[in-house]
Interface confidence: medium
Amino acid sequence: HTAAQDNCTCPTNKMTVCSPDGPGGRCQCRALGSGMAVDCSTLTSKCLLLKARMSAPKNARTLVRPSEHALVDNDGLYDPDCDPEGRFKARQCNQTSVCWCVNSVGVRRTDKGDLSLRCDELVRTHHILIDLRHRPTAGAFNHSDLDAELRRLFRERYRLHPKFVAAVHYEQPTIQIELRQNTSQKAAGDVDIGDAAYYFERDIKGESLFQGRGGLDLRVRGEPLQVERTLIYYLDEIPPKFSMKRLTA
């Protein structure tokens, strides 16, 4: 793992404990909470990051859905179960034996049940829509410049292959970034769109997960792009299964 040798830290994940106890005295970093070894040359999985983050859950809020099957993370934070590769286990349960199924970004996609609840597979989130509203500026941003800057950000900061940034839409003051990545498209070593979206979300909130790097300073042709609010919608390869009661609530 390419953790910084001199001071033995993980550039892509500050929520780690690092020590030079790897093969040949190399720096090895383990995620807080799970103790799993992480690859510091790329993004850490969202599951391990959530596991490491021990803060109180955020209040639920009903939000806009871009389609009847779109999910929004209304449940906030929880302490997830991750598999040996750091992915979310399809079934998540809390300490009171209440269980539910999640998608590949850890968002609940079924009603809650008891320990008998079955989640046959981890359903992939193949389309993520990041909806941002920017603070007022003297004028609208140039769409082409905005598009280029956001694509550069996902490529350089989050190491997401450009082909997975499907589109950047702009209608002042709203920006929508569409990330798309089917199971068949994702090759070994590719950053997952769910992980990239999570790092971006934390960056936007001023809670950067990167070690030692300054916070996100987004600029379009020198003009600061300051985000007022963010909504993230998740669309799964298989539509979620909720009772009608929840869908009409």
Epitope: L63, V64, R65, R133, H143, H169, Y170, Q172
Partner: antibody
Framework: EVQLQQSGPELLKPGASVKISCKAS????????MHWVKQSHGKSLEWIGG????????NYNEKFKDKATLTVDESSSTAYMELRSLTSEDSAVYYC??????????????WGTGTTVTVSS | DIQMTQSPASLSASVGETVTITCRAS??????LAWYQQKQGKSPQLLVY???TLADGVPSRFSGSGSGTQYSLKINSLQPEDFGSYYC?????????FGSGTKLEIK
């Protein structure tokens, strides 16, 4: 069936204010932004502004910024437009129309029934 | 702000004829253009969006085309119910301006 039902005609004196309503039915109110359009007699259409129901975020045409105020009441799936300091120039038919929140799909797919506002002394 | 120049202002045609209405934007609107039909005393109705996509329930005799700054709406084999006013509207950036309209009348 998706419908946008607007309030009835208004006859007002110059300097007065009026609040027009647009009640949505047949769809999830918060999945769409609500926009308002002015059509003066025998003339073209003018976009006044739009509102994002979840947050009350508004977007106005500069021309109407001091004239119109857009609000929504999510509980009743109703959008409102208040027009103030009315003059004869404000006499027109006003339409509400909806637009999906998805920016890759941009159009007004459903229009309200229209509200006629007449300003006369 | 982007201005929309629509032409012609009025047009007389007979049932069965083909007509074309054009809209020119003052800047590139990247195909974010919609066309509406409005009958006398009625609300506008969506015909075409994203420059070329026909709205649900719109007959196939209507078609949209164009890119960049130049767009057009073509109506093949005019039917009696097609007469009325037509408006284009861009959605590239706010304000979402409309064209001045084209009144299509029976010859």
């Amino acid at each position: 069936e998706v419908q946008l039902q607007q309030s009835g005609p208004e006859l007002l004196k110059p300097g007065a204010s009026v609040k027009i309503s647009c009640k949505a039915s047949g769809y999830t109110f918060t999945d769409y932004t609500m926009h308002w359009v002015k059509q003066s007699h025998g003339k073209s259409l003018e976009w006044i502004g739009g509102i994002y129901p979840n947050y009350g975020d508004t977007n106005y045409n500069e021309k109407f910024k001091d004239k119109a105020t857009l609000t929504v009441d999510e509980s009743s799936s109703t959008a409102y437009m208040e027009l103030r300091s009315l003059t004869s120039e404000d006499s027109a038919v006003y339409y509400c129309s909806r637009k999906t929140v998805l920016l890759r799909l941009r159009y007004f797919d459903v229009w309200g029934t229209g509200t006629t506002v007449t300003v006369s002394s | 702000d982007i201005q929309m120049t629509q032409s012609p202002a009025s047009l007389s045609a007979s049932v069965g004829e083909t007509v074309t209405i054009t809209c020119r934007a003052s800047g590139n609107i990247h195909n974010y253009l919609a066309w509406y039909q409005q009958k006398q005393g009625k609300s506008p109705q969506l015909l075409v969006y994203n420059a070329i996509t026909l709205a649900d329930g719109v007959p196939s005799r209507f078609s949209g085309s164009g890119s960049g700054t130049q767009y057009s709406l073509k109506i093949n084999s005019l039917q009696p119910e097609d007469f009325g006013s037509y408006y284009c509207q861009h959605f590239w950036s706010t304000p979402f301006t409309f064209g001045s309209g084209t009144k299509l009348e029976i010859k």
